[in-house]
């Protein structure tokens, strides 16, 4: 009896596992074995198939085979008893463009009111994603095990945080990988769980805020209780995307360990040109805090963010003031290549109630003044760049009194 | 499979000094913290530091502080330990064990073990 | 430093009991705790992290549970292979420290 070729053959690739499935012709009869021959593009033989030869399932695995990824290849399958069926041709495929990204590896963290969340390819250093292994994005699932209802978060990197949550809960959550330059979506990962922890009775550090003085960064930050000791720590914001760098490593700023102030100030030159995060934890101690909300700080919009200067030329019933570049030490004006908007506050010297103006350009009008009144003025800049939302320190208040009437002109 | 694999017993006078080694295999070495363990004979189990192979950044137990060294030959994947000035209660099975990634935002659990190098201090 | 009490510091109990040893610490330590097992003349082995979550190839008879400063392993059936030392850790401050031990032996 002459055997039947096989038929519906799948190939199903997850990261760099290859896995050919395949339906018997016959199942009357027994004891057959299939293998498999492939053959490269531009290729006029057939090479066989290593670990799919005489098998005697409906599947095997070629991942040991090295392939080029990005290079056609066809595959052919016959089965064998005493004699063999014909080949029956599979389909020629790419195997990258056939590939599935597979579930990723999680690891949770839990604070009180957080889960940190460490998201890295499910196969480490994998030939299909090679020259994509930056390229990931993260998306992810999570719900409060005891509602169900679910939260997505889409377009997030190998670390994220997730915060508000609430203490003593268990959350769970599943994740998937994209790379979304070739339009690929992964599987996802296993539902992992873990629960907050109980509430730490020192609450992380609030409202962190760095400005600029002299040469110096000053770093600021709210606190609940006093007699407490901080650390504040620094990372290069790019290594979110890629903990598996081993650069990826929280660092302490020198100046900023053990402070017993909420501030710390530090030379602008212990950060290169870049953007970092910075986080800050108290202690009392004996209990140490969790971290705090991280920080994004870029040195280029930091560093030149300095307090504009001003000019005020005085009438009877307004102020005229003339914005400058500010100065560096050394009285060089900084060159601002982004756009500001600036913050003006004034005030009547005798009194505290402030008004304000905000203005984009730099010849800004504060009308309304009473005449022979001192008022008060300071202003601040703040960026335009809604991703890197920074403003500088106000500068000193300037105060001026204004003409006697009828000199408006 | 992950593997720690420690050097041979030693035997010490005191006042003198003992280096161990741990060289680990299956893992990125420089990605995790390696920690050290010491356990007196029939005690418990005593945290005595960890290192981070990738930078050589360690954080002691301050009862060891001015005694024990820990450093790393990333080429060969080896941590070493020296303790100096030993005395007769430095007696104990030394264990070199891995820690957490380094890229955590905390500390983690102990996951993989060396097999342990017993030291004796006697004159 | 935080201090670790475990108890008992030994127990007897026969194959098919259910077994269950406490962990104290001076301070709350936010679930960031460990249980080890060891076998004499073995290096420890890790059962469980982050109070409830069990290691690979761990048999699931064993669990950790517990929050703040009071934890807890069980061991639902004991096999004769589970009689053995058990040890807390807690890696929440550093030094890390460890529980005193309890010595699991049979009946």
């Known amino acids: 009896k002459n055997l039947k070729s096989p038929q519906k053959v799948e190939v199903d690739i997850i990261d760099d596992n290859f896995i050919l499935r395949w339906n018997r012709s016959d199942e009357s009869v027994g004891n057959v074995t299939f293998s498999f021959d492939y053959q490269k593009t531009g290729m006029d033989n057939w090479i066989k198939l290593s670990g799919c030869q005489n098998i005697t399932s409906t599947k095997c695995n070629f991942s040991s085979l090295k392939l080029n990824v990005y290079e056609e290849i066809k595959l052919r399958i016959r089965a064998e008893k005493e004699n063999t069926s014909s080949w029956y041709e599979v389909d020629s495929f790419t195997p990258f463009r056939k590939a599935q990204i597979g579930p990723p590896e999680v690891h949770l963290e839990a604070e009180d009111k957080a889960i940190v969340i460490h998201i890295s390819p499910g196969t480490k250093d994998s030939v299909m994603w090679a020259l994509d292994g930056l390229s990931f994005t993260y998306s992810l699932v999570i719900w409060k095990n005891s509602s169900g209802v679910e939260e997505r978060i889409e377009n997030i990197y190998s670390r994220h945080k997730i915060y508000k949550l609430s203490p003593e809960t268990t959350y769970c959550l599943k994740v998937k990988a994209a790379l979304l330059t070739s339009w690929k979506i992964g599987v996802y990962s296993p539902v992992h769980c873990i629960k907050t922890t109980v509430e730490n009775e020192l609450p992380p550090p609030e409202n962190i805020e760095v400005s600029v003085q002299n040469q110096n960064y000053v770093l600021k930050w709210d606190y609940t209780y006093a007699n407490m000791t901080f650390q504040v720590q620094w990372l290069h914001a790019f290594l979110k995307r890629n903990p598996g760098n081993h650069l990826y490593k929280w660092k302490q700023i020198p100046d900023c360990e053990n402070v017993k102030t909420t501030q710390c100030v530090f030379p602008q030159n212990v950060f290169q040109k870049g953007i970092y995060l910075l986080r800050v934890q108290a202690s009392d101690g004996n209990n140490t805090s969790f971290w705090s909300e991280e920080i994004k700080f870029d040195t280029e919009i930091q560093a030149f963010l300095l307090p504009p200067v001003f000019n005020i030329r005085s009438l009877s019933d307004s102020f005229h003031i003339y914005i400058g570049a500010p100065k560096q030490s050394g009285n060089t004006p900084v060159i601002q290549d982004y756009p500001l908007i600036y913050e003006i506050i004034f005030w009547e010297n005798t009194s505290n109630a402030e008004r304000k103006i905000i203005e984009k350009k730099t010849d800004v009008t504060v009308p309304n003044l009473k005449p022979l009144t001192v008022y008060c003025v300071k202003a601040r800049a703040h960026t335009m760049d809604e991703k890197l939302n920074k403003s500088s320190v106000f500068s000193d208040a300037v105060c001026e009194k204004t003409k006697p009437g009828n000199t408006s002109k | 499979q992950v593997q720690l694999v420690q050097s041979g017993a030693e035997v010490k006078k005191p006042g003198a000094s003992v280096k161990v080694s741990c060289k680990a295999s299956g893992y990125t070495f420089t990605s995790y913290w390696m920690n050290w363990v010491r356990q007196a004979p029939g005690q418990g189990l005593e945290w005595m530091g960890k290192?981070?192979?990738?930078?050589?950044?360690?954080h002691f137990n301050q009862k060891f502080r001015d005694r024990v060294t820990m450093t790393r030959d990333t080429s060969t994947s080896t941590v070493y330990m020296e303790l100096s000035s030993l005395r007769s209660e430095d007696t104990a099975v030394y264990y070199c064990?891995?820690?957490?990634?380094?890229?955590?935002?905390?500390?983690?659990?102990?996951?993989?073990w060396g097999q342990g190098t017993l030291v004796t201090v006697s004159s | 430093d935080i201090q670790m009490t475990q108890s008992p510091s030994s127990l007897s109990a026969s194959v098919g009991d259910r077994v269950t040893i406490t962990c104290k610490s001076s301070e709350v330590i936010y679930n960031r705790l460990a249980w080890y097992q060891q076998k004499p003349g073995k290096a420890p082995k890790l059962l469980i992290s982050g109070a409830t979550t069990l290691e690979s190839g761990v048999p699931s008879r064993f669990s950790g549970s517990g929050s703040g400063k009071d934890y807890t392993l069980t061991i639902s059936s004991l096999q004769p292979e589970d009689f053995a030392t058990y040890y807390c850790?807690?890696?929440?401050?550093?030094?890390?420290?460890f529980g005193q031990g309890t010595k699991l032996e049979i009946k």
């Open positions: 064990a891995r820690g957490g990634r380094i890229s955590f935002d905390y500390d983690a659990a102990l996951d993989y």
């Open positions: 290192i981070d192979p990738s930078d050589s950044e360690t």
């Open positions: 850790q807690q890696y929440w401050n550093k030094p890390f420290t």
